[in-house]
């Protein structure tokens, strides 16, 4: 149930993002973000996930890249880039590891 | 209950390498989950974080210091240590090992802290 | 990088409430934590992720935090609570811990 928060073995990720407590934070898995809203510059946020892992399958758009992954700071130089304005019709999504 | 025990010698000559141990007991430093954490307190001063590291060797430098720190751990001695390279008079404080809590990393046990002096 | 600032000094008379403030771009978005240090001693944790308490530590020490401005309050004061205050978030952009540089509560 992707509403419901794991309850699996805690991962330790790398957090990048201003709501971080400090330099890593535990979940059940890591996550990238990279978002561009309207008009600013592309922002890169690294964290732990523990709700709605089918983010994860999100295929990139031009303006949201979400990226998973299930080891110890894996996500720690992990870089995304964001799909171009007109995306390949059959470009797959990803569930990193 | 957790206790920290910083060691080292008390003074230093400007230039030199000051180095310091903190020993843990009452908690393994491999197993719990958490990282180790040096704080400095120059005298009549404010607290100035040092840096973090975990027992696998992961670390964490105070930007302004980093490329005069190296940290380490020993697990078999339920260790972890600080060096500090080509110290100066400014380097003179309280020198704290810490432990910061699980995910909120808040500093929640603490060594007593000693005074290293820099000098001639 | 992220500055702190906190007023070096606050005074109250005992019984009162002692209000200590953190001021900090947007602290609101961080979590702020509180020390307690009394001459010659190590730091105690006095509040954490805001307005938590540690286990020990009397109901009369609550925190907050919003805006550009985190409060640690003791309600009650008692002459045991002279000390040097510290708060202390984890800044992202320059990947350190940041201190405030104090304040000292005097109990008249």
């Known amino acids: 149930d992707p509403v419901k928060p794991s309850r699996g073995p805690l991962v330790t990720c790398t957090c990048e993002s201003p709501h971080c407590k400090g330099p890593t934070c535990r979940g059940a898995w890591c996550t990238v973000v990279l978002v561009r809203e309207e008009g600013r510059h592309p922002q890169e946020h690294r964290g732990c996930g523990n709700l709605h892992r089918e983010l994860c399958r999100g295929r990139p758009t031009e303006f949201v890249n979400h990226y998973c992954c299930d080891s110890h700071l894996c996500n720690h130089n992990v870089s995304l880039v964001l799909e171009a304005t007109q995306p390949p019709s059959e470009q797959p999504g990803t569930d990193g590891q | 209950q957790v206790q920290l025990q910083e060691s080292g010698p008390g003074l230093v000559k400007p230039s030199q390498t000051l180095s310091l141990t903190c020993t843990v007991s009452g908690g393994s430093i491999s197993s719990s989950g958490h990282y180790w954490s040096w704080i400095r307190q120059h005298p009549g001063k404010g607290l100035e974080w040092i840096g973090y590291?975990?027992?696998?060797?992961?670390?964490y430098y105070n930007p302004s210091l980093k490329s005069r720190i190296t940290m380490s751990v020993d697990t078999s001695k339920n260790q972890f240590s600080l060096k500090l390279s080509s110290v100066t008079a400014a380097d003179t404080a309280v020198y704290y090992c810490?432990?910061?809590?699980?995910?909120?990393?808040?500093?929640?046990?603490w060594g007593q802290g000693t005074l290293v002096t820099v000098s001639s | 990088s992220y500055v702190l600032t906190q007023p070096p000094s606050v005074s109250v008379a005992p019984g009162q409430t002692a209000r200590i403030t953190c001021g900090g771009n947007?602290?609101?978005?961080?979590?702020v934590h509180w020390y307690q240090q009394k001459p010659g001693q190590a730091p105690v944790l006095v509040v954490y992720?805001?307005?938590d308490r540690p286990s020990g530590i009397p109901e009369r020490f609550s925190g907050s935090n919003s805006g550009n401005t985190a409060t640690l309050t003791i309600s009650r004061v008692e002459a045991g609570d002279e000390a040097d205050y510290y708060c202390?978030?984890?800044?992202?952009?320059?990947?350190?811990?940041?201190f405030g540089g104090g304040t000292k509560l005097t109990v008249l």
């Open positions: 992720n805001d307005g």
């Open positions: 202390q978030v984890w800044d992202s952009s320059s990947a350190r811990v940041v």
């Open positions: 590291i975990y027992y696998s060797g992961d670390t």
């Open positions: 947007n602290i609101g978005s961080k979590t």
């Open positions: 810490a432990r910061p809590k699980l995910d909120d990393w808040a500093l929640d046990y």
